[in-house]
C-alpha cells in the first residue's frame, strides 16, 4: 500500500505562437482544478477506461479574472498535492491522465459550470520511494508542469511497496535471513510468506504461498522478464499460450530502453543509458531542451552541441536536482555550533547563537563573566554560555542588585512567623516548636529533640537564623 503524489507547478500558455485566450474574463471569473487518473502498466487505454490504480481531484484554485488586453498568464493553482492512495503493490509502470478543469463562477442557473480545458496523458516507469520526477506536458496551446512520486505507507517498503517492515525484536540485529529495512534501519523485514523462491524484487504476494508478478515479469516465481519484441514485429511469432511472453536470459532481454537507449544489467534490474535528448528510466521521456526552460530557480541551462540536444542545469547556491528543483537543506549539515539555531534564508545561511556564543557559526565562546560584575559582593560563575551570579546573603536577582526577601519562601515551619533581619531571617515559632526554622517539636515533658536551648533562651523564643 502507498500513495501516488502529484504536485502541479504551473498551467499556462506554452511557448510558441498562438497563445491561448485566458479561460476567465471579468464577466466570467473562474478557477481551476485538476483531476488525475492512474492505470497500471504502459497500456494506451482510452481516457474513459477505469482508473484501476485510482484517481483524485484537487481543491479549487483561487478565483481568477482576466486583465483586459493581457495575454493569458500562468493561472493561479490550487494549494497542496493530489494524492492517489493505492491498496496493492505499486506496479512500477503506469499510465496517467491529468485533466485541467475550469469552474466558471458567473451567474449560471443551477450553480457553477465546469468545462475541460486540457488533458495530458503519458506512460512512465517509476519506482516507489524514489525522488520527485519532474515533467512538462503540452495540450494544444497549453502547457502543464508537474512533479510526481510514489511512496509506500508503513509498514510497506521497497520499490513496489511489497516488502513489509516490523520493529526489531532484538535490539542488535534482525532474525535469520531477514534484512534491515532501509531507510528504517531500526526495523526488520517481516518474514516472507510468499511462495518459496518468489522473486523478492519482481514478485509479491497478498496471500501466503502465492507469487504475483510486477509489470514486466512473468513465470511461476516472477524471475522471467517479459519480452515484447516479438509482439511488436508483424512477422514475429504470436501464441495464445505465451501471449507473446518470451522467456529471456536477463532483464535486458528485448531491450526495455526506448529511443535507442542501451541497456545494461544491474544486480537488481537494468539501467538504460539514454541518447541525447531523452531521459527517464527507459529513455521514454524525450525532447526537453533549453528552449523549454527546464531549469528552475535561476538555474543556468546549457545545451549540447546543437539546439535540439539534451540539456544540463547548473544550479545556483541552495538548489540541486537535475532541474534545480530541489532546495538544499543546508541546515541538515548542522553548521551552527554550540546549539545555535540554523536559518536558511535562501541567499545565505544564518546562525542564531545561544547566549554566550558569537560568530557566523556561533563558534566563539564568549567569556561569560568578562565585564559582568555581580553587585553587593556577589561572585560570577561561568557555565553553559551564560553567566550566573552567586549572591551574598540578603541579595538576589541576575546581578545581585535586588535585596532578597528571605521570608518569601516561607522558611519557618509549623506555623512559625518569619521576620526579615539585616543578616538573614528570624523565625518566631508557634508554641510547641523550636529550632532555627521551627522544625523541631518540643517534647511534652519540656525536653526537646535537640540539645537544651542555650542559656537565656526559652524553647519557643525566636531563634535567629545565621
Amino acid at each position: 500500500a502507498g500513495v501516488f503524489e502529484l504536485q502541479i507547478h504551473s498551467f499556462g500558455p506554452g511557448p510558441g505562437p498562438g497563445a491561448p485566450r485566458s479561460p476567465c474574463s471579468a464577466r466570467l471569473p473562474c478557477r481551476l482544478f485538476f483531476r488525475v487518473c492512474l492505470k497500471p502498466g504502459l497500456s494506451e487505454e482510452a481516457a474513459e477506461s477505469p482508473c484501476a490504480l485510482g484517481a483524485a481531484l484537487s481543491a479549487r484554485g483561487p478565483v481568477y479574472t482576466e486583465q483586459p488586453g493581457a495575454p493569458a498568464p500562468d493561472l493561479p493553482l490550487p494549494d497542496g498535492l493530489l494524492q492517489v492512495p493505492f491498496r496493492d503493490a505499486w506496479p512500477g509502470t503506469f499510465s496517467f491522465i491529468i485533466e485541467t478543469w475550469r469552474e466558471e463562477l458567473g451567474d449560471q442557473i443551477g450553480g457553477p459550470a465546469w468545462s475541460l480545458l486540457a488533458r495530458v496523458a503519458g506512460r512512465r516507469r517509476l519506482a516507489a520511494g524514489g525522488p520527485w520526477a519532474r515533467d512538462i506536458q503540452r495540450a494544444g496551446a497549453w502547457e502543464l508542469r508537474f512533479s510526481y512520486r510514489a511512496r509506500c505507507e508503513p509498514p510497506a517498503v521497497g520499490t513496489a511497496c511489497t516488502r513489509l517492515c516490523r520493529p526489531r525484536s532484538a535490539p542488535s540485529r534482525c532474525g535469520p535471513g531477514l534484512r534491515p529495512c532501509a531507510p528504517l534501519e531500526d526495523e526488520c523485514e517481516a518474514p516472507l510468506v510468499c511462495r518459496a523462491g518468489c522473486s523478492p524484487e519482481h514478485g509479491f504476494c497478498e496471500q501466503p504461498g502465492e507469487c504475483r508478478c510486477l509489470e514486466g515479469w512473468t513465470g511461476p516465481l516472477c524471475t522471467v522478464p517479459v519480452s515484447t519484441s516479438s509482439c511488436l514485429s508483424p512477422r514475429g511469432p504470436s501464441s495464445a499460450t505465451t501471449g507473446c511472453l518470451v522467456p529471456g536470459p536477463g532483464p535486458c532481454d528485448g531491450n526495455p530502453c526506448a529511443n535507442g537507449g542501451s541497456c545494461s544489467e544491474t544486480p537488481r534490474s537494468f539501467e538504460c543509458t539514454c541518447p541525447r535528448g531523452f531521459y527517464g528510466l527507459r529513455c521514454e521521456v524525450s525532447g526537453v531542451t533549453c528552449a523549454d526552460g527546464p531549469c528552475f530557480n535561476g538555474g543556468l541551462c546549457v545545451g549540447g552541441a546543437d539546439p535540439d540536444s539534451a540539456y544540463i542545469c547548473h544550479c545556483p547556491p541552495g538548489f540541486q536536482g537535475s532541474n534545480c528543483e530541489k532546495r538544499v537543506d543546508r541546515c541538515s549539515l548542522q553548521p551552527c555550533r554550540n546549539g545555535g539555531l540554523c536559518l536558511d534564508l535562501g541567499h545565505a545561511l544564518r546562525c542564531r547563537c545561544r547566549a554566550g556564543f558569537a560568530g557566523p557559526r556561533c563558534e566563539h565562546d564568549l567569556d561569560d563573566c568578562a565585564g559582568r560584575a555581580c553587585a553587593n559582593g556577589g561572585t560570577c560563575v561561568e557555565g553553559g554560555g551564560a553567566h550566573r551570579c552567586s549572591c551574598a546573603l540578603g541579595f538576589g536577582g541576575r546581578d545581585c542588585r535586588e535585596r532578597a526577601d528571605p521570608c518569601a519562601a516561607r522558611p519557618c515551619a509549623h506555623g512559625g512567623r518569619c521576620y526579615a533581619h539585616f543578616s538573614g531571617l528570624v523565625c518566631a515559632c508557634a508554641p510547641g516548636y523550636m529550632g532555627a526554622r521551627c522544625e523541631f517539636p518540643v517534647h511534652p515533658d519540656g525536653a526537646s529533640a535537640l540539645p537544651a536551648a542555650p542559656p537565656g533562651l526559652r524553647p519557643g523564643d525566636p531563634q535567629r537564623y545565621l
Epitope: 523549454d292 531549469c295 535561476g298 549540447g304 540536444s309 547556491p317
Partner: antibody, heavy 119, light 115 residues
Framework: QVQLVESGGGVVQPGRSLRLSCVAS????????MHWVRQAPGKGLEWVAI????????YYGDSVKGRFTISRDNSKNTLYLQMNSLRVEDTAVYYC????????????WGQGTLVTVSS | DIGMTQSPDSLAVSLGERATINCKSS????????????LSWYQQKPGQPPKLLIY???TRASGVPDRFSGSGSGTDFTLTISSLQAEDVAVYYC???????????FGQGTKVEIK
C-alpha cells in the same frame, strides 16, 4: 552597496600575458556567478567568460577560448582573468559583472580597466 | 552563429517624446522556467559602465524609472522610453543568453540623442 573594482590593466605587447583582478564588496561574493565583459574602443559589448559561484563551472567566448582563464578566490572576494597570448584585437576596457540568476543577465558592473595590446 | 540586430543604429528624439528601439535575434530567445525570455536591455552613458534596465524582456531592474519598458517574445523585442528626458541620452544594448554552447550575446547598440 554592491561594488566591483577592476585592476591590472595596462599596455602589453602581443603574445604576452596579463592578469586582471576584480574585488567585490557589498554582497555575498561566494553566492554569485561572475562574468568578464569587454568593450573595444568605440565599439559594442562582448561577453568574455563566466565562472559559477563555486568556481567549478567556467565558460568562455569563442574569441578567447584556450587563451584566457577565469578564476576566483572566494576567501578574498576576488575574481581574476588570466590573459595569455594576447592579440591586438584584445585591446578593450574589461568589465567584471555580477550574474543575475533570475534574468540570466549582468545586474552590477565595475568601472572597467583598460587593456592595450600594442607592439 | 547567433546574432542580435538592433535598429535603428541611432535615434534623435525630442524631449518628452517617445523613443523606440528594436532588437531582433537570429534564433528564438530562450525562456526561463516560467517561460519569460532571457532578454535584457542596458544603458551606457559616455565614460561609464553599462547599467541593467530591463531583464526577462519586460521586468524593470530596481531603481529604473517607469518610463522605460520592455516587450516582445520569440525573436523580436522592443525597448520603449515613453517620455525622453535629457539624462536618457546614452547607448542602449539588448542582450540575450544562448545555451549551445553557452554565451551571452549583445546587439551592436543604439545611440539615443535629443533632437
Amino acid at each position: 552597496q554592491v561594488q566591483l573594482v577592476e585592476s591590472g590593466g595596462g599596455v602589453v605587447q602581443p603574445g604576452r600575458s596579463l592578469r586582471l583582478s576584480c574585488v567585490a564588496s557589498g554582497f555575498t561574493f561566494s553566492n554569485c556567478g561572475m562574468h568578464w565583459v569587454r568593450q573595444a574602443p568605440g565599439k559594442g559589448l562582448e561577453w568574455v567568460a563566466i565562472i559559477w559561484y563555486d568556481g567549478n563551472i567556467k565558460y568562455y567566448g569563442d574569441s578567447v577560448k584556450g587563451r584566457f582563464t577565469i578564476s576566483r578566490d572566494n576567501s578574498k572576494n576576488t575574481l581574476y582573468l588570466q590573459m595569455n597570448s594576447l592579440r591586438v584585437e584584445d585591446t578593450a576596457v574589461y568589465y567584471c559583472g555580477r550574474h543575475d540568476y533570475g534574468g540570466n543577465s549582468f545586474d552590477y558592473w565595475g568601472q572597467g580597466t583598460l587593456v592595450t595590446v600594442s607592439s | 552563429d547567433i546574432g542580435m540586430t538592433q535598429s535603428p543604429d541611432s535615434l534623435a528624439v525630442s524631449l518628452g517624446e517617445r523613443a523606440t528601439i528594436n532588437c531582433k535575434s537570429s534564433q528564438n530567445v530562450l525562456p526561463n522556467s516560467n517561460k519569460k525570455h532571457y532578454l535584457s536591455w542596458y544603458q551606457q552613458k559616455p565614460g561609464q559602465p553599462p547599467k541593467l534596465l530591463i531583464y526577462l524582456a519586460s521586468t524593470r531592474a530596481s531603481g529604473v524609472p517607469d518610463r522605460f519598458s520592455g516587450s516582445g517574445s520569440g525573436t523580436d523585442f522592443t525597448l520603449t522610453i515613453s517620455s525622453l528626458q535629457a539624462e536618457d541620452v546614452a547607448v542602449y544594448y539588448c542582450q540575450q543568453y544562448y545555451s549551445s554552447p553557452p554565451e551571452w550575446t549583445f546587439g551592436q547598440g543604439t545611440k539615443v540623442e535629443i533632437k
